[in-house]
Interface confidence: medium
């Protein structure tokens, strides 16, 4: 019978941070500058990601791991591994599939992220509107007219509002 010989690939011994150099008799050579190999046994090193323009470096590239990017202030990451940077919306806006859009009347967003939410309905708690709402701010509820007597309590904070979760008709 024919004796089987070892079929182990010599390149499998090359650790992360190196590559199996065919030009040098399959010796494990360190990855060149600005490249990396995150797993052993690789025949080439991958070029490091460069965080340019609106991207900024969150983690430097090393011989064993790629650089990681995030976004400059005023932008936020989208996609796997922060493949895109999208501009933050302003207060009074929300992010939709068509970009940042102003909150419609009766809703507000006091953050640069998230959705427009309905103003608090003060009358549900038997209160009146003390300060009108805007695109950026919820209404402030105050005591009901019947409560406006000497020694009436001060303004109560608005109850949390909840987005209806359906399309406008």
């Amino acid at each position: 019978f024919e004796r089987t010989r070892s079929l182990q690939d010599p390149c499998s011994n090359c650790p992360a941070g190196t590559f199996c150099d065919n030009n040098r008799n399959q010796i494990c050579s360190p990855c060149p500058p600005n490249s990396f190999s995150s797993a052993g046994g690789q025949r080439t090193c991958d070029i490091c990601r460069q965080c340019k323009g609106v991207f900024r470096t969150r983690k430097e590239c090393s011989s064993t791991s790629n650089a990681e990017c995030d976004c400059t202030p005023g932008f936020h990451c989208l996609g796997a591994g922060c493949s895109m940077c999208e501009q933050d919306c302003k207060q009074g806006q929300e992010l939709t599939k068509k970009g940042c859009k102003d909150c419609c009347f009766g809703t507000f967003n006091d953050q640069k992220r998230g959705i427009c939410r309905p103003w608090t309905n003060c009358s549900l708690d038997g209160k009146s509107v003390l300060v009108n709402g805007t695109k950026e701010r919820d209404v402030v509820c105050g005591p009901s007219p019947a409560d406006l007597s000497p020694g009436a309590s001060s303004v109560t904070p608005p109850a949390p509002a909840r987005e209806p979760g359906h399309s406008p008709q």
């Epitope: 936020h76 939709t96 599939k97 068509k98 959705i115």
Partner: antibody
């Protein structure tokens, strides 16, 4: 009353084209949100097929559906349709039409807030 | 293709139990939070429970809650009720070269 209603043949022969229509009532295509088709093979999970933007007519299809699927909209009849060509038994499913929810400003938000009741399409000779 | 994996695929629970379902996506959803959860009962269309990862849809009981960001999300039912026995699906919205939607593999909650 806001609702979606699918209609079309319940039986389609292999290699033929499946055609379904979704009739919209209670609202009109006057915003930039999407109308979509989703299917569910018997006893299996939900599978997105594609969507059409009611604002500009752009279409978005699942990778498996490209080349086989056409979604179109007829705003005058307040309906949209699905055509799936070269069907096989693997296309047997309940087909749902669904509306993408719109933001307060009337733009698509990525999730589905209104669904039709679904229609079973069987592919068999 | 984007893969959305739910775990467990099925679970047995009793009324009053706290139930947690996870959803893992092979890519980050749009804006890290464009993730929705649906409940489906046999012979019925899915019903929206949670949108934007953590927002409760209109008319949904507060025992349902959602959390997570990017690729990993969780649906929690704090105290399971008889009407909650159903199949649950996560759904993500993605933007690469174009808009793309994907559903999770589903989790069936039984008695």
């Amino acid at each position: 009353q806001v609702q979606l209603q699918e209609s079309g043949p319940g039986l389609v022969k292999p290699s033929e084209t499946l055609s379904l229509t979704c009739k919209v009532s209670g609202f009109s295509f006057n915003n930039d949100y999407d109308m979509c088709w989703i299917r569910q093979p018997p006893g299996k999970g939900l599978e997105w097929i594609g969507c059409i933007d009611t604002g500009d007519g752009s279409t978005y299809y699942a990778s498996w559906a490209k080349g086989r699927v056409t979604i179109s909209v007829d705003s005058s009849k307040n309906q949209f349709s699905l055509k799936l060509s070269s069907v096989t038994a693997a296309d047997t499913a309940v087909y749902y039409c669904a509306r993408e929810a719109a933001s307060s400003s009337g733009y698509g938000m990525g999730y589905f807030d209104l669904w039709g009741q679904g229609t079973l399409v069987t592919v068999s000779s | 293709d984007i893969q959305m994996t739910q775990s467990p695929s099925s679970l047995s629970a009793s009324v009053g139990d706290r139930v947690t379902i996870t959803c893992q996506s092979s890519q980050s959803v749009y804006d890290n939070n464009w993730l929705a959860w649906y409940q489906q009962k046999p012979g019925k269309a899915p019903k929206l429970l949670i949108y934007r990862a953590s927002n409760l849809a209109s008319g949904v009981p507060s025992r349902f809650s959602g959390s997570g960001s990017g690729t990993d999300f969780t649906l929690t039912i704090s105290s399971l009720q008889p009407e909650d026995f159903a199949t649950y699906y996560c759904q993500g919205t993605y933007l690469s070269s174009n808009w793309y939607w994907a559903f999770g593999t589903g989790t069936k909650v039984t008695v």
